[in-house]
């Protein structure tokens, strides 16, 4: 049994880091493998993660961590029974993938303005809470070409757009994702999408 693709990990910079790797053949990850992780810190304890299958030869493990700080560094050991297959390390602050925003809501009752709001996925005491920026994706269910991205570079988790910038009388969907420049993070996953019917009164044309 050998590791074909070494573990790569990302942290949500809160409580979970996710590591993925590939073996050289079909593997029952949960029965055959264990990923050990230990914070490189005074008197830290070692922890065992039981991986799940992620495709035939792929494995994924969700490492539970206490509140992460930028200096944190973990040793990682991948074991098959009593055989050490791979040894490495992981610094969560250098591999951050933020949590996806939640509770995306479209408010359509604001005088021909669409107000999109969502929730910041972090509690106020987390460093990323005040450092997230967002991308909002709006697309038409009827017209694949009608696809747009709005970058929200301010901290407030909301976006206002004129309803008239979208076509009237058709359904749209929206989703939102987050990233943090301070840690040069990757983008989060997209939030679940929400759907609404876009309708607004066309202004009377003057002849």
């Amino acid at each position: 049994m050998k590791v074909l693709q070494e573990p790569t990990c990302v942290s949500d910079y809160m409580s979970i880091s996710t590591c993925e790797w590939k073996m050289n053949g079909p593997t029952n990850c949960s029965t055959e493998l264990r990923l050990l992780y230990q914070l490189v810190f005074l008197l830290s304890e070692a922890h065992t993660c039981i991986p799940e299958n992620n495709g035939g030869a792929g494995c994924v493990c969700h490492l539970l961590m206490d509140d992460v700080v930028s200096a944190d560094n973990y040793t990682l050991d991948l074991w098959a029974g009593q055989q050490l297959l791979w040894k490495g390390s992981f610094k969560p602050s250098e591999h951050v993938k933020p949590r996806a925003p939640g509770n995306l809501t479209v408010h359509t009752n604001v005088s021909d303005t669409l107000l999109l709001t969502w929730s910041n996925p972090y509690p106020p005491d987390n460093y990323l809470y005040n450092h997230l920026t967002y991308a909002v994706n709006i697309w038409s269910e009827n017209d694949p070409a009608d696809f747009r991205i709005y970058n929200v570079t301010y901290l407030e988790p909301s976006l206002r757009i004129a309803a008239s910038t979208l076509k009237s009388g058709i359904s749209y969907r929206a989703r939102v994702r987050a990233w943090a420049q301070c840690y040069n993070t990757t983008w989060s996953e997209w939030s679940p999408s929400t759907k609404w019917h876009n309708s607004y009164r066309e202004p009377f044309e003057q002849h």
Partner: antibody, heavy 117, light 107 residues
Framework: EVQLVESGGGLVQPGGSLRLSCAAS????????MSWVRQAPEKRLEWVAI????????YYPDSVKGRFTISRDNAKNSLYLQMNSLRAEDTAVYYC??????????WGQGTTVTVSS | DIQMTQSPSSLSASVGDRVTITCKAS??????LAWYQQKPGKAPKLLIS???SLETGVPSRFSGSGSGRDFTLTISSLQPEDFATYYC?????????FGGGTKVEIK
């Protein structure tokens, strides 16, 4: 070369106090956690106090908690162990040791503490 | 607390002998184990960490093996300066605990 030299051991009566010192050299003292490890006659090695490099975190096993206090002076490259309310079972050789997160990578020669009336 | 049991507690051997010391843990440590050497009146010295990794400056006649609960320290060809007491220590879970020691004496 890393050197750790303990001093301050001796004979003390039960209930008495003693202060051990450890002079460190040959490494950047403030960058390392330090510890006191003891070995009682016919007993196992046992760590009794640990302090972080900056001195802001300290750790004790239940056997000495509330009686022993570890401290350090990074400007003087010195480590200390204040031992109060000493008991006969605290009789041991006390070693100053540098802690590499989880194991002890350099040790001093030890100083003997005898608690007896 | 994790219990560490070393065996034998003492052994007699001659220069050139192959010596094996075992350390058994009360629970699975994977490879979170260190070995120390202590000569009479001297400071203990770290020999091995991670069950198998030799520390810088430690002679290659020393080797560590094992994982899980059973670990071994081997001296391939005993030298006069190797007569000492050897201890194992687990760092899987705090409080980190030591074995009772194995005294290697001259036959």
């Amino acid at each position: 070369e890393v050197q750790l030299v303990e001093s301050g051991g001796g004979l003390v009566q039960p209930g008495g106090s003693l202060r051990l010192s450890c002079a460190a050299s040959g490494f950047t003292f403030s960058s390392y956690a330090m510890s006191w490890v003891r070995q009682a006659p016919e007993k196992r090695l046992e760590w009794v106090a640990i302090i972080s490099g900056g001195g802001d975190s300290t750790y004790y096993p239940d056997s000495v908690k509330g009686r022993f206090t570890i401290s350090r002076d990074n400007a003087k490259n010195s480590l200390y162990l204040q031992m109060n309310s000493l008991r006969a079972e605290d009789t041991a050789v006390y070693y100053c040791a540098r802690l590499h997160y989880w194991y002890f990578d350099f040790w001093g020669q030890g100083t003997t503490v005898t608690v007896s009336s | 607390d994790i219990q560490m049991t070393q065996s034998p507690s003492s052994l007699s051997a001659s220069v050139g002998d192959r010596v094996t010391i075992t350390c058994k843990a009360s629970e699975d440590l994977y490879n979170r184990l260190a070995w120390y050497q202590q000569k009479p009146g001297k400071a203990p010295k770290l020999l091995i960490s991670g069950a198998t990794s030799l520390e810088t400056g430690v002679p290659s006649r020393f080797s560590g093996s094992g994982s899980g609960r059973d670990f071994t320290l081997t001296i391939s060809s005993l030298q006069p300066e190797d007569f000492a007491t050897y201890y194992c220590q687990q760092y899987w879970r705090n409080p980190y605990t030591f074995g009772g020691g194995t005294k290697v004496e001259i036959k």
